[in-house]
C-alpha cells in the first residue's frame, strides 16, 4: 500500500468485533445507495441524495456528492456541524478548491473501490476533505493514534465502531481560500486543527474543540466546548489571542459572561 508519510495524526476507530456488529440492524431494504454510518459507524444506512441536508454528523452523502454549506452561509463550519449543509455534485464544487493543498493519495487503489462506500465528504469554503476508506493493515499508523470508543446508540441498535479488518476513516483537510498566514491566531488554530487531525467526520462532537473566531481570525471572547445532548458545553473567556482569562469559566450549569473582556 501507499505510505502515509506526511499524513500527520490519524484516527483509528475502535475495532468492530462480532459482538458490536451484532448490534447493527439489518440494512434498510429500499435505498438508492447504502453507505456506512457517519463517524466510526460500521452499520449500513441509506446515503443522502443530491439536495438533501447534510453535515459532519449526519448520514453521508452518496458517491459523487459532497456536503457543502450554502454559499451565503455566514458560519460555514458551524453550518456543517449543525447539519445545515447540502449534498451537491462533487464536480460542481471543484472550482472552489483552487487553493487546495495537495492531498496524499489513499493507501491502496486510488480509484473509488467498493470498500470506499462513503465517498460523500464534507466541504466548506474554509475546509475541504477527501474521504478514503483505507485498510489499517496497509496503513502504517504513526504519530498520535486516537481510538474512538464505542457509544451505545440503543435507539438505532447501532454502535459507533468500525471494521478494523476492513477500514479506517481518515479525513484530510486543507486551506481553500486564502493563505493561513493572512489570518489571526484563532483562524490559524482552526486551520491547524483541521489540517492535522484529519478526522473531523469521524470524531464525536465533544472530542474536538474548534475555536470560535471573529472575521479577522482572532479569538472571540467566549469559547465553548460543544454541547453533548442536553448537557451544555464547558465555556471560558479568552483574550483576542486565545489566552484564558481567570475567573470566567462555567461547567455548563450556568452561562459564562465575558462582558468586560476585550477580544477585538
Amino acid at each position: 500500500g501507499a505510505s502515509s508519510a506526511g499524513l500527520g495524526p490519524v484516527v483509528r476507530c475502535e475495532p468492530c468485533d462480532a459482538r458490536a456488529l451484532a448490534q447493527c440492524a439489518p440494512p434498510p431494504a429500499v435505498c438508492a445507495e447504502l453507505v456506512r454510518e457517519p463517524g466510526c459507524g460500521c452499520c449500513l444506512t441509506c446515503a443522502l441524495s443530491e439536495g438533501q441536508p447534510c453535515g459532519i454528523y449526519t448520514e453521508r452523502c452518496g458517491s459523487g456528492l459532497r456536503c457543502q454549506p450554502s454559499p451565503d452561509e455566514a458560519r460555514p463550519l458551524q453550518a456543517l456541524l449543525d447539519g445545515r449543509g447540502l449534498c451537491v455534485n462533487a464536480s460542481a464544487v471543484s472550482r472552489l478548491r483552487a487553493y487546495l493543498l495537495p492531498a496524499p493519495p489513499a493507501p491502496g487503489n486510488a480509484s473509488e473501490s467498493e470498500e470506499d462506500r462513503s465517498a460523500g465528504s464534507v466541504e466548506s469554503p474554509s475546509v475541504s476533505s477527501t474521504h478514503r476508506v483505507s485498510d489499517p493493515k496497509f496503513h502504517p499508523l504513526h504519530s498520535k493514534i486516537i481510538i474512538i470508543k464505542k457509544g451505545h446508540a440503543k435507539d438505532s441498535q447501532r454502535y459507533k465502531v468500525d471494521y478494523e479488518s476492513q477500514s479506517t476513516d481518515t479525513q484530510n483537510f486543507s486551506s481553500e481560500s486564502k493563505r493561513e498566514t493572512e489570518y489571526g491566531p484563532c483562524r490559524r488554530e482552526m486551520e491547524d486543527t483541521l489540517n492535522h487531525l484529519k478526522f473531523l467526520n469521524v470524531l464525536s462532537p465533544r472530542g474536538v474543540h474548534i475555536p470560535n473566531c471573529d472575521k479577522k481570525g482572532f479569538y472571540k471572547k467566549k469559547q465553548c466546548r460543544p454541547s453533548k445532548g442536553r448537557k451544555r458545553g464547558f465555556c471560558w473567556c479568552v483574550d483576542k489571542y486565545g489566552q484564558p482569562l481567570p475567573g470566567y469559566t462555567t461547567k455548563g450549569k450556568e452561562d459564562v459572561h465575558c462582558y468586560s473582556m476585550q477580544s477585538k
Epitope: 440494512p27 434498510p28 431494504a29 467498493e114 440503543k154 435507539d155 441498535q157 479488518s165 476492513q166
Partner: antibody, heavy 116, light 107 residues
Framework: QVQLVQSGAEVKKPGASVKVSCKAS????????ISWVRQATGQGLEWMGW????????NYAQKLQGRVTMTTDTSTSTAYMELRSLRSDDTAVYYC?????????WGQGTLVTVSS | DVVMTQSPSSLSASVGDRVTITCRAS??????LNWYQQKPGKAPKLLIY???SLQSGVPSRFSGSGSGTDFTLTISSLQPEDFATYYC?????????FGGGTKVEIK
C-alpha cells in the same frame, strides 16, 4: 455466558399458527436485536427477519410479510416469532440468533412440523 | 435479492488437508460477509465475520478473505472436528441471504 433457549417442538396442521419463544440470558437483552432463521430438513438456511429488542422495530423477509410477526418481552428477555397460515413447506427447524447482520449466538432450534 | 453461490456443494478431504471453500455474491457486497459452521442436529456457529475477521474462540486454522463478489474460507489443516457443513451469509442488503452450504466429508 450468553444463552438463547428456545421452546419445544411443535406439530401443527396446515392453516394453523405457531409461536416459538426464545429466552435470552447472559447479556443485556435490549442492546441487541434478535433474528430468526429457519432450515428445512436437509436444506440451507433462510433468514426470516429481525426485531430490535430495544424498540420493537422489525425487518421481515418479503416472502413472509403478512404471515410472520416478531415480538419481544423485555421483562422476561424473551423474543417470539409467530408464523400464521402454516403450509407443509413451513416444516423446518426455526432458530433464533442474536444480532441483526452477524449472528454470534444461536438458540438450539425448534422443530415445527406442519402435517395434516 | 443478493444470491450467494457456494462451491463446491460438497468435498471429501483428509485430516491435515488444506481446504478451500468459495462463495460468490450476485452483486458486490463489499466485505459484508460472514461464515458459519454447522454440525448435524446443531445450530450454526459463527466462524468469520466481515469477510476476514476471526470470531473469538475459533481456531486460527480458519481464515477468510475476499471482498466485492468473491470470497474464500480456508481451513489450513483440517481437523477431525472440522467435518461439517459451512455456510456463507451476506449482510449487505435485506433480505440477508445464505449460500447453499458446502459439506466437508471425510475421504
Amino acid at each position: 455466558q450468553v444463552q438463547l433457549v428456545q421452546s419445544g417442538a411443535e406439530v401443527k396442521k396446515p392453516g394453523a399458527s405457531v409461536k416459538v419463544s426464545c429466552k435470552a440470558s447472559g447479556y443485556t437483552f435490549t442492546s441487541y436485536g434478535i433474528s430468526w432463521v429457519r432450515q428445512a430438513t436437509g436444506q440451507g438456511l433462510e433468514w426470516m427477519g429481525w426485531i430490535s429488542a430495544y424498540n420493537g422495530n422489525t425487518n421481515y423477509a418479503q416472502k413472509l410479510q403478512g404471515r410472520v410477526t416478531m415480538t419481544t418481552d423485555t421483562s422476561t428477555s424473551t423474543a417470539y416469532m409467530e408464523l400464521r397460515s402454516l403450509r407443509s413447506d413451513d416444516t423446518a427447524v426455526y432458530y433464533c440468533a442474536r444480532g441483526g447482520i452477524v449472528f454470534d449466538y444461536w438458540g438450539q432450534g425448534t422443530l415445527v412440523t406442519v402435517s395434516s | 435479492d443478493v444470491v450467494m453461490t457456494q462451491s463446491p456443494s460438497s468435498l471429501s478431504a483428509s485430516v491435515g488437508d488444506r481446504v478451500t471453500i468459495t462463495c460468490r455474491a450476485s452483486q458486490s457486497i463489499s466485505s459484508y460477509l460472514n461464515w458459519y459452521q454447522q454440525k448435524p442436529g446443531k445450530a450454526p456457529k459463527l466462524l468469520i465475520y466481515a469477510a476476514s475477521s476471526l470470531q473469538s474462540g475459533v481456531p486460527s486454522r480458519f481464515s477468510g478473505s475476499g471482498s466485492g463478489t468473491d470470497f474464500t474460507l480456508t481451513i489450513s489443516s483440517l481437523q477431525p472436528e472440522d467435518f461439517a457443513t459451512y455456510y456463507c451469509q451476506q449482510s449487505y442488503s435485506t433480505p440477508l441471504t445464505f449460500g447453499g452450504g458446502t459439506k466437508v466429508e471425510i475421504k
